[in-house]
Interface confidence: medium
């Protein structure tokens, strides 16, 4: 069955810089793909970015830019203007709408104990939403 | 205040094509994706697709493919909607709403509506 | 394309009463459901979004509730403002979709 991974990493030169990366596991095309923080079911629950293949990519701050790396995996790049960082104990998560299997979401954080440059390993997590 | 103001009723004859205008205010037309919506008389709404106006970018309903022809122009901070090939099917209220920034995808305002009869 | 369907097309209730709208999805939307009033001079406006949350300026005797394929609307102490026609719409997958419409009268 399709699933969904989620990692976040802190960059190592910009201590308030992060990266949300998401992909997608499965066959078939992505039509959609749907970032957001806050956690399906959390508070907040704002879109941070969308990436479409024929509408193109939006993005709304923090992030600051979003863009495909492969046919099925995205980046989104996030940058904290304040003093202190509000994105270590976020929750974010990617959704991708897949033709013709239906949408998967998952989620994912930065690990609490992360040093800048590392990130969790790219499995998914279990939180995933079928349709 | 975000305000999406829609062009005036139009009567058109069928097999001809109408454009209808969707001026948005009070935030910028291109942080924001648009969308457009048909109600056919006392009935259920029905997508037609969507505009990413910052890059001209569309994704249309399958129905209205052929059908529908969305535009922006940036400088005035307009959407628009073509139709074609006008039939009684295509008699109409038209809207255009704005796509959120909320996580649930929804439109969160929306333009009054323009009225479309098709008859000869 | 994702079906949904609002069995009651309309209802009627009193002013002060309690009235709950329902919403059913042909398949999981995974809370990724609106909810919309259309008054009866065509003007349209967005009360709920994914699932339960208040769209800002929405007096808070609506609320919205449900999960997966089944959600719902509540209206507590129903107004004469309140009288419209309700819709839901699911913003999972496009196609967007939307619900029939339940047209809420007054007794």
């Known amino acids: 069955t399709p699933e969904v991974w989620v990692q976040v990493q802190m960059e190592a030169t910009e201590l308030s810089s992060f990266t949300v990366h998401c992909g997608f596991l499965g066959p078939g095309s992505i039509s959609l793909v749907t970032v957001s923080w806050g956690g399906p079911d959390g508070a907040g629950g704002t879109k941070l970015a969308v990436l479409h293949p024929e509408l193109g990519t939006r993005q709304w701050a923090p992030a600051r830019q979003a863009r495909w790396e492969t046919q099925s995996s995205i980046s989104l790049a996030l940058e904290d203007s304040g003093a202190s960082s509000p994105f270590a104990n976020t929750t974010f998560c990617c959704k991708f709408a897949s033709f013709p299997e239906g949408s998967w979401e998952s989620c994912g954080s930065l690990p609490p104990s992360s040093d800048p440059g590392l990130s969790a390993p790219p499995t998914p997590v279990p939180i995933l939403r079928a349709d | 205040e975000v305000q999406l103001q829609q062009s005036g009723p139009v009567l058109v004859k069928p097999g001809a094509s109408v454009k209808m205008s969707c001026k948005a205010s009070?935030?910028?037309?291109?942080?924001?994706?648009m969308h457009w919506v048909k109600q056919s008389h006392g009935k259920s709404l029905e997508w037609i697709g969507i505009?990413?106006?910052?890059?001209?970018?569309?994704s249309y309903n399958q129905k209205f493919k052929g059908k529908a022809t969305l535009t922006v122009d940036k400088s005035s901070s307009t959407a628009y909607m073509e139709l074609n090939s006008l039939t009684s099917d295509d008699s109409a209220v038209y809207y255009c709403?704005?796509?959120?920034?909320?996580?649930?995808?929804?439109?969160?305002?929306w333009g009054q509506g323009t009225s479309v009869s098709v008859s000869s | 394309d994702i079906q949904m369907t609002q069995t009651t097309s309309s209802l009627s209730a009193s002013l002060g009463d309690r009235v709950t709208i329902s919403c059913r999805a042909s398949?999981?939307?995974?809370?990724?459901l609106n909810w919309y009033l259309q008054k009866p001079d065509g003007t349209v406006k967005l009360l709920i979004y994914?699932?339960?949350r208040l769209h800002s300026g929405v007096p808070s005797r609506f609320s919205g509730s449900g999960s997966g394929t089944d959600y719902s609307l509540t209206i507590n102490n129903l107004e004469q403002e309140d009288i419209a026609t309700y819709f839901c719409?699911?913003?999972?997958?496009?196609?967007?979709?939307f619900g029939g419409g339940t047209k809420l009268e007054i007794r």
């Open positions: 709403a704005r796509d959120s920034s909320n996580v649930g995808n929804d439109m969160d305002y």
């Open positions: 009070g935030y910028r037309l291109t942080d924001y994706y």
């Open positions: 505009i990413n106006p910052y890059n001209g970018g569309t």
């Open positions: 398949q999981d939307i995974s809370n990724y």
């Open positions: 994914y699932s339960s």
């Open positions: 719409q699911q913003g999972n997958t496009l196609p967007r979709t």
